[in-house]
Each structure stands twice: as C-alpha cells, then as structure tokens.
C-alpha cells in the first residue's frame, strides 16, 4: 500500500524510540568509522525531519524514498573522502545505485579498536548519568563492528543490556550480577551476528531462490504440522524481511518483522503448538522467541514420500508445470519428516532430486530413469553422520582447547595462505561445535553441528572475500552454498604451498602474556601453532604436540619467575632453538 510519505509511515508504525534506534544502527552499519557524536547528530536531524512529515505528509521532501533521505544525510558527512576513500564516490551516484554502492563498502572486519570493558562501577555511573546515551553507544558500537547485524534483533539485545544494568547496578555485588550477563550477551551477540551474516550472504551471493529453499527446509522442520501453503506464505514473508535488513532497509525490515510475528501468533493454530508462550510476550521478545522456538511434533502417520515423488505417474508433469513449487513441496515433505537432518543436507537431497528430474523427465522412460533416486540419498546422509561421529569422538577425547588445536592444524594445512588471525578465529569457532553439539542425542547432533559449521565457514568466506589469497577458499565459498562444508572437508594438505620463512620475532613472547585471561592466552598459543604449521606444513602431530607442550611449560615457568621479562627473553631463545631442531627448521 502506497503512502504519501514513507518516512512518516515508518515513524508512526515503529514509534520514536525504535525509529531513532534503527536509524542509528543503519548509519553506523554504513559509516563504520564515524564518531558516535556525528551519528547522533545525523539521527536527530532525520528524526526532526520525520516529525515534520508526520505533522504534514505533503511537506517538502517528505515524499522522498528512505534511501534518498538517508543517503543524502550520509553524504553530508564532511570527512567522507578522508575517512572512507573511494566510498565517497557513492555520493556521486543516484538511487538505487548509491545505496548499492554503500552496501558494497560494508566492512566485515573494520579496523576498529577492540571493545574493552570498563570497571563495573564506571559502567554503572555512566548508565545512571545518561541512560539514553549509554544505550545508544551500545547500539552504535555493535552495529559498526557488525554491519550485517539483524537490526530488530539488536533492539532486543539492547533491551536486555538495559535490563542487566537496571538490575545489577542496584545489586550488593554489582560485578557478580552484571559480568555473567554481559558475557552471555556478548557470546549470544556474536552468534546472532554470524547467523545473520550467513542469511545475507545467501541472499546476496546466491540469490532469493537459495534463501527461500533454506527457509522452506528450516520452517518445515520447525512447523511440521503446518500445510505447505502456510509454510510458503511464511517463507515469502521471511524472505522479504531478511532481504530488507540485508539491503540496509532497516525500518521496513523491523516493521515487516513485527507484522510477521503478529500473523504467526494470530494463526498459531495452523502453524505450531509450540508458539503459545512466545505469543504472550512483548514484541521484541516475541519475535526473538518465535525465531528460536523448538520444533513442533511431527504429525502421526505421514505417508511415504515415494508415493508422490517417485511412484506417481504425474511426477514429471507436475515438475514441468511448476518446477520450483514442486521442488518446494519435496523439500517441505522431506524436511518435516526429518528434524534429525541438517538444513544443508536437506538442500543437498533436494538438489539431487532436481538434477535427477531434469535428466529423467526429458528421457524416453522417465519413471525407469528416476525410480532409484532415493537410493542416491544414502551416501549424502551418511557422509555428515560419519564426520560428526568421528569429530565428536575426537572432541570427547581431547576437550575443547585441544580439539580446536587439531582443527587449527587441519585447516592451516588445507589453506595456509589465509591470514593467521582468520585461521585462529575460524578454527576456534569450528572447535566450539564440540561443546555446542556433541552433548546432544544422535537425533539432534546433525542439525546442530552441520548448520553451525555453515555459519562459521561463512565467516571464513566473507573475511577471505575482502582480501582473497587462496583459490581453494574462493572455490569452496563460491561454487555451492550447501556444499561449502563438504568442499572444505575434502581439501587435503596444499602441496603447492611454499613454507613461510622462519621469523624468530613471531615466536618471541613477553611478560604481558601472564596478565592475559585464559582465553587470550589460548589465542596467543594458537597463533603460534598456526605460524609453526605455516613454517613447517609437513610437521607431524607428534612434533607439533611436543613443541606446544614445551611452549606451555615455558609460559607457565616464566609467569611464575620473579624476573618474568628476563625469563621470557632467555628461555624464549632456548625454546625457539629447541623447536627449530625438533621441527628440522
């Protein structure tokens, strides 16, 4: 439905508080280097303008599109050329090219300082002194570091952030109350950001059809009692929401997400029996709850899939009449019967089915040709099952840290050209699959593990895309979204790699390592491990283990020494020499 003023429409729908928060997120996700104060100023100007349009929708410029209004506002930033370089060229373009240009310049790994958490008392004072500014700063800092963060969900995080400070700053032991909550928000936030990044990559790199297929599979698992037509409607609406958010249309996205939550709750009887609690919550909690809701129970007595998709004489006729719909029905029927499969596996099965129909329906005897199509699924199902079984056994044997190290070695050997920080970050996250998924029973392991790995490997893909260094990574990332994980799993040691020159500086450590948290210390050691493998890609597990054990002992010893710095200098030289000898460097 057309509105005379889009900005007034969204302001009225969302309310002033959400409107301002979403505009701040949008601006911070586009101009990631701009100071907080500059963004607040721009947001206030846009908000004042929106209010004039609410008062009179026919007022000057109120009929302009949101992209035009926001883009014009961003292009008033004085230091655009100095701060952002070629991004300033976007401002010479007209809409919609200008917005596309801004989107292309979003940086998944912006050069921003690490967020350091101040003392609890300092944070509580800041919170009490100016709650509004404190919360805006949170939105700004998260949005600029995560330019694809799902904006309506960030509002939910901000609400929880505020609740944590409201409660804990009054508590007797502020730190004991607040710090675990902030840790939880940080970890959940990183996970949420990574999940959304995959959705945006799916839409932007593989198109709407790929995203819709993912959504059909996931929603069919979640809502197995819903009819295909109902699932299709939800998929269409969900695709619109994510297309908007990934495209920077955050006001429309948040508005449409609210509408979708409303529709789901009004129609929960025909969607899922698990939605009741979610639908009693306020809007932000409700939307989050629906997105995370557990799978409903499968209907009893579902007929065999073979009847409609293999045995029916109408398979090719139905496929020819509406290919994507017929494949969608196949995916829906398969997914609702298999909550124990990962979404990516279901998509691989659907792709195999599609390829078979494309070949067989054009053949002389189609039925004879596709009669055994379900037999082709067996190896596709067994491959992730076996991989998960093996890796969970390894995880249970090693524990998380050493399991991460095994993956670090494995992935550094596969793609040694990738930067060390990226290899460490990605391998650490890959390693978290163990504690996240291996505790689950068999029926939940695959959807947990393989769909999580898809999210983590997408991080590798987006970071690598910024500065491509490996043809093998590019190939696995771009050829097929659903086959990324099997593609990386299948990579062997890169025999073409020329080992890195040995640099003693890389293995020089100082007393500051002693004051680091356990996590930071692990990262230091894992960074050294990656560098070792880059120097000696053919090093055996045993050799690497010996060097890493020596390294751990060296850190422990020097951190206990009276003169730590001297210990690190002297013992460090010995360690480097011993390691070189052990590895034959």
């Amino acid at each position: 439905d057309a509105h005379k003023s889009e900005v007034a429409h969204r302001f009225k729908d969302l309310g002033e508080e959400n409107f301002k928060a979403l505009v701040l997120i949008a601006f911070a996700q586009y101009l990631q280097q701009c100071p907080f104060e500059d963004h607040v100023k721009l947001v206030n100007e846009v908000t004042e303008f929106a209010k004039t349009c609410v008062a009179d929708e026919s007022a000057e410029n109120c009929d302009k599109s949101l992209h035009t209004l926001f883009g014009d506002k961003l292009c008033t930033v004085a230091t655009l050329r100095e701060t952002y370089g070629e991004m300033a060229d976007c401002c010479a373009k007209q809409e919609p090219e200008r917005n596309e240009c801004f989107l292309q310049h979003k940086d998944d790994n912006p050069n921003l300082p690490r967020l350091v958490r101040p003392e609890v008392d300092v944070m509580c004072t800041a919170f009490h002194d100016n709650e509004e500014t404190f919360l805006k700063k949170y939105l700004y800092e998260i949005a600029r570091r995560h330019p694809y963060f799902y904006a309506p969900e960030l509002l939910f995080f901000a609400k929880r952030y505020k609740a944590a400070f409201t409660e804990c700053c009054q508590a007797a032991d502020k730190a004991a109350c607040l710090l675990p909550k902030l840790d939880e928000l940080r970890d959940e936030g990183k996970a949420s950001s990574a999940k959304q990044r995959l959705k945006c990559a799916s839409l932007q790199k593989f198109g709407e059809r790929a995203f819709k297929a993912w959504a059909v599979a996931r929603l069919s698992q979640r809502f197995p009692k819903a009819e295909f037509a109902e699932v299709s409607k939800l998929v269409t609406d969900l695709t619109k929401v994510h297309t908007e958010c990934c495209h920077g249309d955050l006001l429309e996205c948040a508005d449409d997400r609210a509408d979708l939550a409303k529709y789901i709750c009004e129609n929960q009887d025909s969607i899922s029996s698990k939605l009741k609690e979610c639908c009693e919550k306020p809007l932000l909690e409700k939307s989050h709850c629906i997105a995370e809701v557990e799978n409903d129970e499968m209907p009893a007595d579902l007929p065999s899939l073979a009847a409609d998709f293999v045995e029916s004489k109408d398979v090719c006729k139905n496929y020819a009449e509406a290919k994507d719909v017929f494949l969608g029905m196949f995916l829906y029927e398969y997914a609702r019967r298999h909550p124990d499969y990962s979404v990516v596996l279901l998509l691989r099965l659907a792709k195999t089915y599609e390829t078979t129909l494309e070949k067989c329906c054009a053949a002389a005897d189609p039925h004879e040709c596709y009669a055994k199509v379900f037999d082709e699924f067996k190896p596709l199902v067994e491959e992730p099952q076996n991989l998960i079984k093996q890796n969970c056994e390894l995880f249970e044997q090693l524990g998380e840290y050493k399991f991460q190290n095994a993956l670090l070695v494995r992935y550094t050997k596969k793609v040694p050209q990738v930067s060390t920080p990226t290899l460490v970050e990605v391998s650490r996250n890959l390693g978290k699959v163990g504690s996240k998924c291996c505790k689950h029973p068999e029926a939940k392991r695959m959807p947990c593990a393989e769909d999580y790995l898809s999210v983590v490997l997408n991080q590798l893909c987006v970071l690598h895309e910024k500065t491509p260094v490996s043809d093998r990574v590019t190939k696995c990332c771009t050829e097929s979204l659903v086959n990324r994980r099997p593609c990386f799993s299948a990579l062997e040691v890169d025999e073409t790699y020329v080992p890195k020159e040995f640099n003693a500086e890389t293995f020089t450590f100082h007393a500051d390592i002693c004051t680091l948290s356990e996590k930071e210390r692990q990262i230091k050691k894992q960074t050294a491990l990656v560098e070792l493998v880059k120097h000696k890609p053919k090093a055996t597990k045993e050799q690497l283990k010996a060097v890493m054990d020596d390294f751990a002992a060296f850190v422990e010893k020097c951190c206990k020494a009276d003169d730590k710095e001297t210990c690190f200098a002297e013992e460090g030289k010995k360690l480097v020499a011993a390691s070189q000898a052990a590895l034959g460097l």
């Epitope: 020819a320 009449e321 509406a322 054009a362």
Partner: nanobody, 123 residues
C-alpha cells in the same frame, strides 16, 4: 495482470489438423511451465499436455499421444498446440493455463487460464 488469449480453434473434419496459439502476458512466461486443458460439452476438465519452462520436458495425455504436439516460443511469449489426425472425441473448448502461486499443482481450476478456443471435429 495475467492474461492468456487462445486462438486458432474452428471446425474441422475428422483426420484434419489445427494449430492453437496462446498469447501470454503479465507474468514471467519464460520461467513458467504451461499446460493445455480441454472441456468437452457436458464434461469436466481434461488435461491434454504440459511443457516445461525451457521446453525440455513435455508430457501428453494417453488420448492425444502421437497426434498432438505442444511447443512454445519464449521470445514471443506464445504457447502452441499442433493437433493432427483429429477425432470427434477431440471436440472441446481448449484452454491454455499456468500455475498460480498457492494452488495445488494439477488442480487446474486454481490455475490462471484464458477464455478458451472452441475446436469442433465433425464430418
């Protein structure tokens, strides 16, 4: 707005031939499967033939196999049905149709379709 306009019908003797055309507009013809269905006087709808978006997959009802040929020209947004060796039982109104989102595949009442063109086969 989806529009399907059939033409080419008429009266013909048994054993004769006709070529039906269907001009399509208002939707993505080149990515849509297309169907010919017919309705004989006093009877229900009967599926005749289906052609996929890229014309690689073609299906016919047993009653017309070997006599009718379905084809399409995606550049012209037009669907065809070449009917040879016509019989009295082929007398019907012929409709071209395409799947409409939200309807069941093969449930032709729910498809988009044209106003039809009458084919009469009589000696």
């Amino acid at each position: 707005e989806v529009q399907l306009v059939e033409s080419g019908g008429g009266e013909v003797q048994p054993g004769g031939s006709l070529r039906l055309s269907c001009a399509a507009s208002g939707f993505a013809f080149s990515t849509s499967g297309m169907v010919w269905v017919r309705q004989a006087p006093g009877k229900g709808l009967e599926w005749v033939s289906t052609i996929s978006d890229d014309a690689r997959i073609i299906r016919y009802a047993e009653s017309v196999k070997g006599r009718f040929t379905i084809s399409r020209d995606n550049a012209k947004n037009t669907l065809y049905l070449q009917m040879n060796s016509l019989r009295a039982e082929d007398t019907a109104v012929y409709y071209c149709a395409t799947y409409r989102a939200g309807s069941r595949i093969g449930s032709y009442e729910d498809y988009y379709w044209g106003q039809g063109t009458l084919v009469t086969v009589k000696p």
